[in-house]
């Protein structure tokens, strides 16, 4: 029931964290303008990844398009692509924890299918997260390296009367939301990981002597696995992952990648 | 077509108050923001007031801050300038304007008049 | 606050000429995110309201005549009525659009020589 209630909240918390991600890629607030020396702007710059905006004190807002590649800056080509890696991983990701969430019936997939199936997605969330997290952060660093470089030569004078300001700008929302997001994508693929772990049915470890009827053959089986005693479950579609040991009806299954997580 | 009316002008007492209004039609009102500008009798024009479309924002200027209130009442596409503590140098015709792209005063109103004086 | 500074204070043309009316502001009226000058000028007929003609310092509003021009960038804004006609005689003024308050300069009149 845990097990289920973690990997059910892991999906969650994932869900709204690529969300979160799409969004913020979306957004046009990544940098905003520094009103700190003009907070009576009639006019208000803020860029994204896309495109850049202004938006006139009048409610006029008029966005450009980067429409160029090889124009742009190489740090916002790698936060773009970072964002886009984590977009996708984090998509595949629903994908596969979807028909891995062990609330969800899909034919006779067994547990090991699924357990599989939950820490892969869980990998695949905490990369997604930190795609997200390494994008936005490169993008706040790229932006106070700027701010400071323009405070640095912030008025130049022209004839000692006329000064241009120039623009400097700050964290946007949508830096936040990605931090956020990456977060929560993060937490989401750290909690699947944790229920893929619990995933398989709770197998009670005895170190354990099997007693036969004809009392001669004592088999005597070390690490966790089930006495063969013949009583209580049938063992027949149970796995048990504790490092490869199978049950007598299963010779022929192997173990898993996620015996060593 | 846009029409903007004001009235409400007339004379008054120094420290006296007074309410101008400015009626708008043939627009969206709701959807542009909004100034008022006044001009001494033959003197230049002085921005006086800005409110934006949904009331968020409003900014004065120096001269009248702290005594002029700019209101605005979307439901009746009405602009309103209440002034108190009236002096003589508020003595001016007074327009309302509409904001438009570039942040420019696309439309005027006609004037009113408001005298200070005792 | 952006102090606009208008030269001439007035000024006298022959009808069919050229005049030119200048506009200074303290700080640039440039602005970066879309490269748009935030200056706007006007026309004022006697006992009229003021008339919009030119926006971001040089887009000429729909139903001005082209005679109207704009240019300029920064701090330095001129504008030009290449050829002019009686109806052109008026006050006109520069504003700053790019920071409150949004201040006017003094005026330019412009009469016919």
């Known amino acids: 029931m845990a097990v289920t209630a973690c990997q059910g909240l892991g999906f969650v918390v994932s869900l709204i964290g690529i969300a979160g991600i799409i969004a913020a890629t979306c957004m046009d607030q990544w940098s905003t303008q520094d009103l700190y020396n003009n907070p009576v702007t009639a006019v208000f710059n803020y860029q994204g990844l896309w495109r850049s905006c202004v938006r006139e004190s009048s409610g006029f807002t008029e966005c450009r398009g980067y429409f160029t590649l090889l124009g742009l800056p190489a740090m916002l080509q790698a936060v773009r692509a970072l964002m886009i890696v984590g977009i996708v991983l984090g998509a595949i990701g629903l994908l596969v924890s979807i028909f891995a969430l062990k609330c969800i019936r899909i034919g006779s997939m067994e547990d090991s299918a699924k357990a599989n199936m939950t820490l892969t997605s869980g990998i695949m969330f905490i990369v997604s997260g930190l795609c997200a997290i390494a994008g936005v952060s490169v993008f706040a660093n790229m932006l106070v390296t700027n701010f400071w470089m323009s405070t640095a030569n912030m008025y130049t004078g022209m004839g000692g009367m006329v000064q241009t300001v120039q623009t400097r700008y700050t964290f946007g929302a949508a830096l936040f939301v990605g931090w956020v997001a990456g977060g929560l994508t993060l937490i989401g693929g750290v909690m699947m990981c944790i229920a893929c772990r619990g995933l398989a049915p709770e197998e009670t470890n005895y170190k354990a002597v099997s007693y036969h009827a004809s009392g001669h053959s004592v088999a005597y089986k070390p690490g966790g696995f089930k006495a063969s005693t013949g009583f209580g479950s049938n063992t027949k579609n149970k796995k048990i992952y504790d490092g490869g040991a199978r049950t007598e009806d299963e010779v022929q299954s192997y173990p898993s990648k996620h015996d060593y997580v | 077509d846009v029409q903007l009316v004001e009235s409400g002008g007339g004379l008054v007492q120094p420290g006296g108050s007074l309410r101008l209004s400015c009626a708008a039609s043939?627009?969206?009102?709701?959807?542009?923001?909004m100034h008022w500008v006044r001009q001494a009798p033959g003197k230049g024009l002085e921005w006086v007031a800005f409110?934006?479309?949904?009331?968020?924002?409003?900014y004065y200027a120096d001269s009248v801050k702290g005594r002029f209130s700019i209101s605005r009442d979307n439901a009746k596409n009405t602009l309103f300038l209440q002034m108190n503590s009236l002096r003589a140098e508020d003595t001016a015709v007074y327009y309302c304007?509409?904001?438009?792209?570039?942040?420019?005063?696309?439309?005027w109103g006609q004037g009113t008049l408001v005298t200070v004086s005792s | 606050d952006v102090v606009m500074t208008q030269s001439p204070d007035s000024l006298a043309v022959s009808l069919g000429e050229r005049a030119t009316i200048n506009c200074k502001s303290s700080?640039?009226?440039?602005?970066?995110?879309?490269?748009?000058?935030?200056l706007t000028w006007y026309q004022q007929k006697p006992g009229q309201p003021p008339k919009l003609l030119i926006y971001?310092?040089?887009t000429r509003e729909s139903g001005v005549p082209d005679r109207f021009s704009g240019s300029g960038s920064g701090t330095d804004f001129t504008l030009t009525i290449s050829s002019l006609q009686a109806e052109d005689v008026a006050v006109y003024y520069c504003?700053?659009?790019?920071?409150?308050?949004?201040?006017f300069g003094q005026g330019t009149k412009l009469e016919i020589k």
């Open positions: 043939g627009f969206t009102f709701s959807s542009f923001g």
């Open positions: 504003q700053n659009t790019y920071s409150f308050p949004l201040t």
């Open positions: 700080q640039s009226l440039l602005n970066s995110g879309n490269q748009k000058n935030y």
């Open positions: 409110i934006s479309s949904g009331s968020h924002t409003i």
């Open positions: 304007a509409r904001f438009q792209y570039g942040n420019s005063f696309d439309y």
């Open positions: 971001w310092a040089s």
